[in-house]
Interface confidence: low
């Protein structure tokens, strides 16, 4: 299709080389007054416009994204050629940063209802640059945490080094929806609830003598509880002796509850004590069996192919540890009688 009639928007993504970050493009079809070809629903001032209710469609996935190759080749369907770019409804998610994401991206409705709808499209010229060392060293992270029940703020990474007074007008989106009230480089949250979690996008306009473009950053915000002050506790095994049958296989499970920690490095391992010797056992990987906001339950099993007399003289010890401390639980095997 002919893209010469598409409205054009220029965006800049400056990514940090020292952190993982994502990026998004919205299929921002023009407002009705800008193009009579795009039949967008008119919104009352109180409604928050979503990207994008074009042609009365409720299905926001009715959008096709293309990339325009720089060598003049035909447009490429994003879904077929770029697995690191994911289309979620009408938003394009870039999962990995890199200058090779630079280029022209075009979106248009899949459903063409009249010959004129071909012009209902947006061309986004994306420039991707690594952050230079000269950029602010302490810029806000692209992953930010809010402590539940307390006051917090979400900072726009590309503007976090500027004072509020210097900051240009910022447009914020949360999970693809415009936050029409927010215009500064920080969103202040008086009391944090779990619904404050999500993907936030901040946009502001920069210009030089020739043109203007939108600088965009994406922030993943999670709501968390405070770091635990407790060492992990072992939920299983509870008993320190276990009745077993000689010659039979045996699996002993160690389940431990770890309180939430922002930097979470749980340790759960099995070792064997035999008289004055002690050694760690190579056992299957630990697995998380329950994860909540406040804690996580992790399980790790020790597997004996068959129980021997020697095993009855040993102690099997489960050892768990977090940044606060460690806990152990030992199990002595006892032959089942009768």
């Amino acid at each position: 299709f002919n893209i010469s009639g598409c409205s054009t928007k220029k965006l800049l993504w400056t990514y940090s080389t020292r952190s993982e970050e994502e990026f998004v493009l919205f299929c921002d079809l023009p407002e009705p007054q800008k193009s009579h070809f795009c039949h967008r629903n008119r919104l009352s001032p109180k409604q928050v416009p979503e990207h994008l209710p074009f042609m009365g469609s409720n299905d926001l996935s009715d959008v096709q994204w293309y990339q325009q190759p720089s060598n003049g080749d035909p447009l490429e369907d994003i879904r077929k050629s770029y697995p690191h770019i994911i289309q979620d409804k009408c938003t394009l998610h870039f999962l990995t940063p890199g200058v090779n994401n630079s280029g022209s991206y075009i979106c248009r409705p899949k459903m063409i209802k009249s010959p004129y709808d071909v012009a209902c499209c947006v061309k986004m010229i994306l420039e991707v640059k690594p952050q230079t060392n000269a950029s602010c060293e302490y810029s806000a992270s692209h992953k930010q945490d809010l402590l539940l029940g307390s006051t917090g703020s979400i900072s726009c990474p590309s503007l976090s080094c500027q004072s509020d007074a210097q900051s240009p007008a910022v447009t914020w989106y949360k999970n693809g929806k415009l936050l029409s009230v927010e215009r500064s480089n920080r969103i202040v949250v008086d009391e944090v609830y779990d619904y404050h979690q999500g993907t936030y996008v901040c946009d502001y306009t920069q210009s030089d003598t020739v043109s203007s473009w939108t600088v965009r950053a994406v922030v993943q915000v999670r709501t968390i509880v405070g770091d635990t002050k407790l060492k992990p506790d072992i939920l299983d095994p509870v008993e320190d002796t276990l009745e077993v049958e000689l010659g039979k296989p045996l699996t002993i499970s160690c389940k431990a509850r770890f309180g939430f920690e922002r930097v979470f490095n749980p340790v759960i391992k099995w070792y064997i004590k035999d008289s004055d010797l002690e050694w760690e056992v190579s056992v299957p990987e630990a697995k998380s069996i329950k994860s909540t906001l406040k804690d996580e339950i992790i399980e790790r099993n020790i597997i004996l192919e068959k129980v021997t007399q020697r095993d009855l003289r040993r102690k099997f010890v489960c050892f768990v540890q977090n940044s606060i401390g460690n806990t152990t639980q030992s199990v002595q095997l006892k032959e089942k009688r009768g």
């Epitope: 050629s81 697995p83 770019i85």
Partner: antibody, heavy 117, light 112 residues
Framework: SVEESGGRLVTPGGSLTLTCTAS????????MSWVRQAPGKGLEWIGF?????SAFYATWAKGRFTISKTSATVDLKVTSATTEDTATYFC???????????????WGPGTLVTVSS | AAVLTQTPSPVSAAVGGTVTISCQAS????????LAWYQQKPGQPPKLLIY???TVASGVPSRFKGSGSGTQFTLTISDLECDDAATYYC????????????FGGGTEVVVK
């Protein structure tokens, strides 16, 4: 196209590296998977590597199999080989079909690895 | 890890007939539709036939039809041709960091 190489006879406990070479498309644009097939048996997915170089594995393959990439090739390293690893190893390109996920749309002819003493 | 169970195997039918292969997943595939069918002939690599449960891959005849959702899927081959004799595999994607994909055990189709 995609082509695997490096298949050979290896003794139990040994290691080897298989290489997958892509031509006609860029590994910067596609994730790549390794799949194996023991003689007369079914297909078994080993793992895949993303365009950004991060690799993901089947539970059974973790530890002994390592997938890595350069700009032109994707490698599969097998360590502590056992006779169960005797198989034809395929490299497959993954194409993204939208929200539903990825599929293997282009396969190499495979390379045979035999583990025997 | 998810397990995909294919039935029956082998299955045979005459030229011009129809065969139906079933694939049962132990857990729902990603978005209920990350399921593909592959055809493999002896000495050859697999070939993608159907993806997204029912979308026929490029160059594949419309005689191949996929259906189902979630955990239960079916491949139907109608107007069987001699060239359809092969082993057919279903494969599910799970969008997870480990065990991202799983293959069914395969179903051999014999054309009489």
């Amino acid at each position: 196209s995609v082509e695997e190489s490096g298949g050979r006879l290896v003794t139990p406990g040994g290691s080897l590296t298989l290489t997958c070479t892509a031509s006609g498309f860029s590994l910067n644009n596609y994730h790549m998977s390794w799949v194996r097939q023991a003689p007369g048996k079914g297909l078994e997915w080993i793992g895949f590597i993303r365009t950004d170089g991060s690799a993901f594995y089947a539970t059974w393959a973790k530890g002994r199999f390592t997938i890595s990439k350069t700009s032109a090739t994707v490698d599969l390293k097998v360590t502590s080989a056992t006779t169960e690893d005797t198989a034809t190893y395929f490299c497959a390109r993954m194409f993204y079909a939208g929200d539903s996920g990825h599929y293997f749309d282009l396969w190499g002819p495979g390379t045979l690895v035999t583990v025997s003493s | 890890a998810a397990v995909l169970t294919q039935t029956p195997s082998p299955v045979s039918a005459a030229v011009g007939g129809t065969v139906t292969i079933s694939c049962q997943a132990s857990q729902s595939v990603h978005n209920n539709k990350n399921l593909a069918w592959y055809q493999q002939k002896p000495g050859q690599p697999p070939k993608l036939l159907i993806y997204d449960v029912s979308t026929v891959a490029s160059g594949v005849p419309s005689r191949f039809k996929g259906s189902g959702s979630g955990t239960q899927f079916t491949l139907t081959i109608s107007d069987l041709e001699c060239d359809d004799a092969a082993t057919y595999y279903c494969a599910g994607g799970y969008g997870s960091y480990t065990d991202t994909f799983a293959f069914g055990g395969g179903t051999e189709v014999v054309v009489k």
